[in-house]
Interface confidence: low
């Protein structure tokens, strides 16, 4: 827990009047169908709302959509459907919002059956105006913006053509046919897979991976026998069919596909899959599915080149390809990830790592909770978190875990306390130290969101009945106030606040139902008068992240450095403000064996920090394949963890010698694959 806090609940004065003056209702002139909401830009206050309603007629379905715009964080909305010529917008494509603060929006319209192409509406002024553009193709996917230049768009057509626009959708050019999947890389590069023999499905495993660095003027084939590809951090991954059988292997490139190395990961068969769980510029978490329909696999963490992998977690819960995993990056504290494992008895348990996958442990039991019926020992149990898997199983879990980079240390999640995840109705738990300790925050399932960089937490009870009450806390979930935001309860459908958790506005969405009709309604509440003053220096306290033993000189060291943060005191009721920047002071730690992962050919026995040689490789020369050349590895078993900044202390030696021998373990010359290298 963050130090120096007043545990007593102090009520916020006169909050009902303050909130009532800042509650804005908007009733939408719409029959209830579906509604989607998008924020346009950062700190602009601009929200677009698209409502769609399908009227089933005898022979066909007639669709109607309306577009609304707010420029004050949802307090007021204006119907701007006339700007898109009252056209029916296809909700499956959503609203394609441009990156950063480009102010760009693309809406894809429904067109009649016989048209030669689709239609889009484009805005580059935060949806003040739209231009209608008829496309020379029917889009299969939403328009994808280049992360580097929002004028560059790509889309796939229903005919599997890859189309590119260089002027924000004004003019389109088909740069390649027979394309299965296309993605933007860095430097406005496009990666895509192509098929030769008829279809993406038929050619799976025989696809080619292409790259264009000049928006389709020229191309380079960078891979063959491709099953699929993915981008993560600075890594490009391809899963490639082996020559001899139906297995696949992962190959990795850190230079946009010019050179490839075979990842030291198990190969997978037809029914298995690989999944990039998380990636940054330092490393990648890779899930490798187990053979058979087990519903689990193994998490591996990579070295800095994405080539050598260490086993991180066994029996990692991940249902079939494209299925559910609970893997969650806790963005409020560096190095922390939460996920679920499937134990031998088929119960599901939550595990947490604080060091980027180096070690996993159970979550500590919350102080204010009892062990439930799943616990064999009523005094010893853990907190288990509900995430995507629970939601997919239709458990009473309205939201996945929540953390925000600028609300340091805060994690909010539904959970149960026992030996495994329970199917009973969950409660909401909060951690204020990045997952080391937990407290029950709210009884029963709730929707929740973080405002003002953690200065306010807002929650609404998950109920099948209409609601009219919102709860809020100004002390990181210790004490709660309730506010009745409307006299007439509404059927609640969602909470919306501006991404980034810097806003002080929350929008409550729902619909009213009367005998004749139902209508969409939103209530936007501004909490600015609750936090009536700006925070000052005295409102913050110093907090050492990852601190477990204050007596230890190396306390707080994770990945080679420790960080002290300025945290808002729980007792301070003030505004961090929209310009709030997390203040942190890093300091480098001495290296210990914990700062190294086991090198190729080595592993760490359980509960041991030393790396020992794999028995099957003892006495063999360690040779592996890198960029198509055979390398000889002289090592005593350690390699520094990617992103680890430690200095001094222990310093295991390793040396890689280029054997100047071609080993083409990579798929650039698949006919010469050398099995020795793996």
């Amino acid at each position: 827990s963050a130090p120096g806090e007043d545990e007593e609940c102090g009520r916020v004065r006169d909050f009902v009047a303050k909130l009532a003056n800042n509650t804005h209702q908007h009733v939408f002139d719409d029959l209830r169908g579906s509604v989607s909401l998008s924020w346009v830009g950062d700190s602009t206050g601009v929200i677009l709302v698209l409502t769609t309603f399908h009227v089933p007629l005898v022979i066909m379905t007639f669709g109607q959509s309306k577009l609304y715009r707010s420029e004050d964080y949802g307090k007021n909305f204006k119907d701007i459907t006339d700007l898109i010529n009252n056209t029916f917008i296809r909700t499956e494509f959503g609203m394609a919002i441009g990156p950063e603060n480009s102010g760009k929006v693309v809406l894809t319209a429904e067109v009649s059956g016989g048209s030669r192409g689709g239609r889009i509406f484009r805005s580059s002024d935060f949806a003040k105006n739209f231009v209608q553009t008829d496309l020379p193709f029917h889009p299969l996917t939403q328009m994808m913006y280049s992360p580097q230049n929002s004028d560059y768009l790509l889309a796939l057509s229903t005919e599997n053509g890859l189309w590119v626009s260089k002027n924000f959708g004004g003019k389109w050019e088909e740069i390649h046919k027979a394309v299965c999947l296309a993605k933007w890389g860095s430097d406005n590069t496009i990666f895509f897979t192509t098929y030769a023999n008829g279809s993406c499905k038929a050619d799976l495993g025989a696809l080619e991976l292409w790259r264009t660095s000049d928006l389709g003027k020229s191309f380079k084939t960078i891979g063959v026998k491709i099953y699929s590809f993915g981008l993560g951090g600075r890594f490009l991954f391809a899963s490639v069919m082996a020559d001899k059988d139906t297995t696949r292997r992962i190959h990795v490139s850190t230079d946009q596909g010019d050179t490839w190395s075979m990842a030291q990961l198990p190969s997978v068969g037809q029914e298995q899959f690989y999944s990039i769980l998380a990636a940054n510029d330092d490393m990648v978490f890779m899930h490798v599915d187990e053979p058979g329909d087990t519903g689990f696999g193994t998490i591996f963490t990579s070295d800095d080149r994405g080539i050598v992998y260490s086993k991180s977690l066994d029996r990692h819960l991940y249902t079939t390809t494209g299925g559910e995993t609970d893997f969650t990056n806790v963005t409020s504290l560096r190095g922390v990830y939460i996920t679920s494992v499937l134990s031998e008895d088929n119960s599901i348990q939550t595990m947490i790592t604080f060091d980027q996958g180096g070690r996993w442990t159970h979550l500590r039991k919350p102080e204010n909770s009892e062990c439930d019926a799943t616990a064999k020992n009523k005094n010893e149990c853990s907190l288990h978190i509900h995430a995507s898997y629970s939601i997919s199983q239709k458990l009473n879990v309205p939201m996945a875990p929540l953390s925000e980079p600028n609300a340091v240390g805060i994690v909010i999640a539904h959970g149960s306390v026992g030996d495994a995840i329970s199917v009973m109705v969950p409660d909401v738990y909060i951690s204020d130290d990045g997952g080391y300790s937990w407290t029950k925050m709210l009884e029963g399932p709730h929707y929740y969101t973080i405002l003002d960089s953690g200065g306010i937490i807002v929650a609404i009870e998950h109920s099948s009945r209409p609601i009219n009450v919102i709860k809020f806390s100004t002390d990181e979930g210790q004490c709660w106030q309730t506010y009745t935001f409307t006299r007439d309860p509404i059927y609640f459908t969602g909470l919306a606040s501006e991404p980034g958790a810097r806003s002080m506005n929350i929008s409550i969405w729902g619909f009213t139902e009367s005998f004749l009709t139902s209508q969409w309604v939103s209530y936007t509440i501004d909490f600015k008068d609750i936090l009536e003053r700006n925070c000052e220096e005295k409102d913050y306290t110093i907090w050492l992240a990852h601190s477990t033993d204050p007596e230890d000189y190396e306390d707080g060291c994770i990945l080679g450095y420790k960080e002290q943060f300025l945290r808002l005191r729980k007792s301070s009721v003030c505004q961090n403000g929209r310009d709030y920047v997390v203040t942190k002071q890093p300091s480098i730690c001495l290296c210990s064996l914990e700062d190294f992962l086991c090198d190729f050919g080595y592993y760490r026995p359980e509960n041991d920090s030393k790396c020992v040689e794999q028995p099957e490789l003892k006495g063999h020369d360690l040779e592996f394949c890198l960029y198509g050349r055979e390398e000889h590895l002289t090592t005593n078993g350690y390699r520094k963890i990617p992103g680890d900044k430690c200095q001094g202390g222990v310093n295991p030696v390793r040396e890689v010698k280029d054997l100047k021998k071609k080993c083409t373990s990579n798929f650039l010359s698949p006919e010469k694959q050398n099995s020795k290298s793996n």
Epitope: D187, N188, S213, D214, K220, D258, W260, L668
Partner: antibody, heavy 117, light 108 residues
């Protein structure tokens, strides 16, 4: 019209250094990879270095690694080649070329580097 | 590294002739090959990329063919301005992206 103009060549003593420049115009410089290629008198073409469009990735043949550094300044539409520890066998015309991926589609007129004592 | 063997190293031909230059590669480069023309004292000029695609402004008498490890540049009906040195270059996989040693085409 695409134009690439090299400069910075000249006479240099063995062991010396030289910085080549290439000024690009007539195209969007920051979406293209760029390369240096050289040609010794009376000999064939030899690839020297390549840099990706954003300058993130650089490539060299093994024989030049450590002695040749390619860099670019996209704000100035310029490509550079820093040559160190020059030897007589580095004497050549050095060309800068636009390198979009599967070919080098536009070349400069070249700049002559002579390494001699 | 991938080896490029260009042949012949030189050949003589007359205006109007059909000429073929070949480039053999030490391993499959999946059509990632370009052809260039260079005249004395001038910079190389791209003729063909991706083995078969004619670069902008290149006359249709030039054509590229081949796949796998064997590639060919053909000039139909040789013109006076075609007498030059021709180079192939691969762009497959691992650098170095080597050039062939060149073929000098001379007037007979």
């Amino acid at each position: 019209e695409v134009q690439l103009v090299e400069s910075g060549g000249g006479l240099v003593q063995p062991g010396g250094s030289l910085r080549l420049s290439c000024a690009a115009s007539g195209f969007t410089f920051n979406i293209y990879g760029m390369s240096w290629v050289r040609q010794a008198p009376g000999k064939g073409l030899e690839w020297v270095a390549t840099i990706s469009s954003g300058g993130i990735y650089t490539y060299y043949p093994d024989i030049l690694k450590g002695r040749f550094t390619i860099s670019r300044d996209n704000a100035k539409n310029s490509l550079y080649g820093q040559m160190n520890s020059l030897r007589a066998e580095d004497t050549a015309v050095y060309y800068c070329a636009r390198h979009p991926g599967g070919a080098m589609d536009y070349w400069g007129q070249g700049t002559l580097v002579t390494v001699s004592s | 590294d991938i080896q490029m063997t260009q042949s012949p190293s030189s050949l003589s031909a007359s205006v109007g002739d059909r000429v073929t230059i070949t480039c053999r590669v030490s391993e499959n480069i999946y059509s990632n090959l370009a052809w260039y023309q260079q005249k004395p004292g001038k910079a190389p000029k791209l003729l063909v990329y991706a083995a078969t695609n004619l670069a902008d402004g290149v006359p249709s008498r030039f054509s590229g063919s081949g796949s796998g490890t064997d590639y060919t540049l053909t000039i139909n009906s040789l013109q006076p301005e075609d007498f030059a040195t021709y180079y192939c270059q691969h762009f497959w996989g691992t650098p170095p992206w080597t050039f062939g040693q060149g073929t000098k085409l001379e007037i007979k």
